[in-house]
Amino acid sequence: FEIALPRESNITVLIKLGTPTLLAKPCYIVISKRHITMLSIKSGERIVFTFSCQSPENHFVIEIQKNIDCMSGPCPFGEVQLQPSTSLLPTLNRTFIWDVKAHKSIGLELQFSIPRLRQIGPGESCPDGVTHSISGRIDATVVRIGTFCSNGTVSRIKMQEGVKMALHLPWFHPRNVSGFSIANRSSIKRLCIIESVFEGEGSATLMSANYPEGFPEDELMTWQFVVPAHLRASVSFLNFNLSNCERKEERVEYYIPGSTTNPEVFKLEDKQPGNMAGNFNLSLQGCDQDAQSPGILRLQFQVLVQHPQNESNKIYVVDLSNERAMSLTIEPRPVKQSRKFVPGCFVCLESRTCSSNLTLTSGSKHKISFLCDDLTRLWMNVEKTISCTDHRYCQRKSYSLQVPSDILHLPVELHDFSWKLLVPKDRLSLVLVPAQKLQQHTHEKPCNTSFSYLVASAIPSQDLYFGSFCPGGSIKQIQVKQNISVTLRTFAPSFQQEASRQGLTVSFIPYFKEEGVFTVTPDTKSKVYLRTPNWDRGLPSLTSVSWNISVPRDQVACLTFFKERSGVVCQTGRAFMIIQEQRTRAEEIFSLDEDVLPKPSFHHHSFWVNISNCSPTSGKQLDLLFSVTLTPRTVDLT
């Protein structure tokens, strides 16, 4: 064999004995009739030698070390070559070592082409015998970053102040390329950054520097994980030790792009996060150790990347192909921000595009799945517009306001389903007829059902909220003058079971001038509470609303107002209330801005209550709450 190393190549070749084995006969390197077991060849030297045995690979190993000095001149960045070429070397187990020395302010990045690297722990070996040993430097101290095999997830390792990379190839391995390149980066301000890329499902076991020995004192090491958004990552600590800290605390920090609480700080003994969708970083931060009894900080952990499990592994079909002007949004329900880590909760379209919010639009069939450990963290909001542009076509036309079954079958709670009902101005009005009579939600008689209908004006300039209504009351229908939004809002998961109670029909009817008319048919022995729209904010100025209250033939209705005065102060115009018997047309008119509200009154026949507002002064709004109670006529009311 002949090995000739060019001058200035900064390469040293060392042939030495390998791992001791029980061999009958030793083997020597023979050079100029001398028999030796170690041969060192330096830059500029040319040496001819042979071996004294037939199978030197059973005895000797060869180390080829190239020193790369980035301190005194430019650094040779780019793809790293195997020099001398493996074809010129004796067929021994060989280790190529690249020792790069750089300034503290220079970041060095090792980039590994496919296959990427897989870290192995103490006592483990690589199936093909090819190992990569990587170490860094802190001042004069060498720090072992780790030993790696092929076929893993580690794609890049960034260090500063220098790096030592040793590539070990068995004598029979045909590899003739280093498989990595070196690039310069700005200072990383930490010991190292290891990038781990997952293309699909898989796991990676990673270790702190110097593992199983102690992580360098008060150092910081970061792992960057690149994970497809449709997969989820979980971190579990396989083994860790804490050192004795004098100052600061040993911890791990998670950085999740897009999270509002970055970084998330954990103790090593905490349960580590699972079910993270997409990329994330994990950093290990050491502390100032007790000089007398430092102990050791070390960490071995596993990142498991997999498709979501169990319920969230299903694919749900949301068929909106027959719908028009409808959008469905799945989004996180608002929660109080806590400093505690919350794993990602994502919804995916076609199992590929995952995000925390997803909006599906009408006209298509959508396939969705979930990446979420707890689906109660999400909810659904749906908007559908029903509009009439031609009053001649729409009049008397009815639409059912019902949540489609496809939506009810999703494993995510429905929060709001809003119907925007639009009519041509001054041409048509709307009437809402529920499948079950409605109760108006009041403080005195709150709704306790799993859902309510929130009815409000849908005219941008108008701030008018008619109220919240739930099944099980006395309101038979609600007529409204112009555009409104009706929102079915759920309050409990039991809505799924109570969904059959929902059902509202909207019809387009001839235009009328009043803002709203409530038709009330009270049930015997139940007290019906009614209140003016925009409760707490006051009835909008110059707005008129009416209640058409039915009284059965054998009953008497008691109308009671819950305060002595309305409290309204008019800036312009008058606020008044008219109570009119429907049969006789007899009416009482009350000036709400002047008069005392009427005492409880008894009505033997159906009657109207109409309330019209003035333009009130601010802070003196019109809010009225009243009740209607039926009692049999036979009772002596004196």
């Epitope: 004995l17 001791p20 006969k25 001398r34 028999h35 077991t37 170690m38 060192s40």
Partner: antibody
Framework: EVQLVESGGGLVQPGGSLRLSCAAS????????MHWVRQAPGKGLEWVAS????????SYADSVKGRFTISADTSKNTAYLQMNSLRAEDTAVYYC?????????WGQGTLVTVSS | DIQMTQSPSSLSASVGDRVTITCRAS??????VAWYQQKPGKAPKLLIY???SLYSGVPSRFSGSRSGTDFTLTISSLQPEDFATYYC??????????FGQGTKVEIK
């Protein structure tokens, strides 16, 4: 099992001679470099001489050159150290050792005392 | 002749401590350095050869490293059986072969 057993040590007067033997078993000494290393009482290790019998290579420390001779009998699988003109400073435990990975096998040592 | 300067000449340590012994060669010896452990009345035992290779049967808490002409023996976590004297030695074929003067590791 590889074993090295030294013999031939003892008390000798200055200027006298001794022949130390190192009987090897478990390997063939003709394939290996065989060495003698000594250790004076309470002191460190000092290399004395080596032989590679297949090629007749021998080598000596300056302190014993011309006085000591290393040899081997491959048929007996034994190495020898012939020590002449002994001095008080030659007093030590003499170890025979095989070298391959390093001084990987050592004998138990034999004490040589040079005193009048 | 190549001199091997070993330091310290003695040290006191406790069980579990990390112990480092260094040897400096007066000139380049490549990686032809070995480390030995010797207990009183016994022959030395080979621990490390070729500067950093662990000899068979030697516990993995022992390790060797080289930086130019400086060689280091490290015991990562000292055990009761490790209290002994340690020697470095240069070369196997470049004569004369020289040993360091030894480092005695004693119980603190």
């Amino acid at each position: 099992e590889v074993q090295l057993v030294e013999s031939g040590g003892g008390l000798v007067q200055p200027g006298g001679s001794l022949r130390l033997s190192c009987a090897a078993s478990g390997f063939n000494i003709s394939y290996y470099y065989m060495h003698w290393v000594r250790q004076a009482p309470g002191k460190g290790l000092e290399w004395v001489a080596s032989i590679y019998s297949s090629y007749g290579y021998t080598s000596y420390a300056d302190s014993v050159k011309g006085r000591f001779t290393i040899s081997a009998d491959t048929s007996k699988n034994t190495a020898y150290l012939q020590m002449n003109s002994l001095r008080a400073e030659d007093t030590a435990v003499y170890y025979c050792a095989r070298v391959y990975y390093g001084f990987d096998y050592w004998g138990q040592g034999t004490l040589v005392t040079v005193s009048s | 002749d190549i001199q091997m300067t070993q330091s310290p000449s003695s040290l006191s340590a406790s069980v579990g401590d990390r112990v480092t012994i260094t040897c400096r060669a007066s000139q380049s010896v490549s990686s032809a350095v070995a480390w030995y452990q010797q207990k009183p009345g016994k022959a030395p035992k080979l621990l490390i050869y070729s500067a950093s290779s662990l000899y068979s049967g030697v516990p993995s808490r022992f390790s060797g490293s080289r930086s130019g002409t400086d060689f280091t023996l490290t015991i990562s976590s000292l055990q009761p059986e490790d209290f002994a004297t340690y020697y470095c030695q240069q070369s196997y074929y470049v004569y004369p072969i020289t040993f360091g003067q030894g480092t005695k590791v004693e119980i603190k």
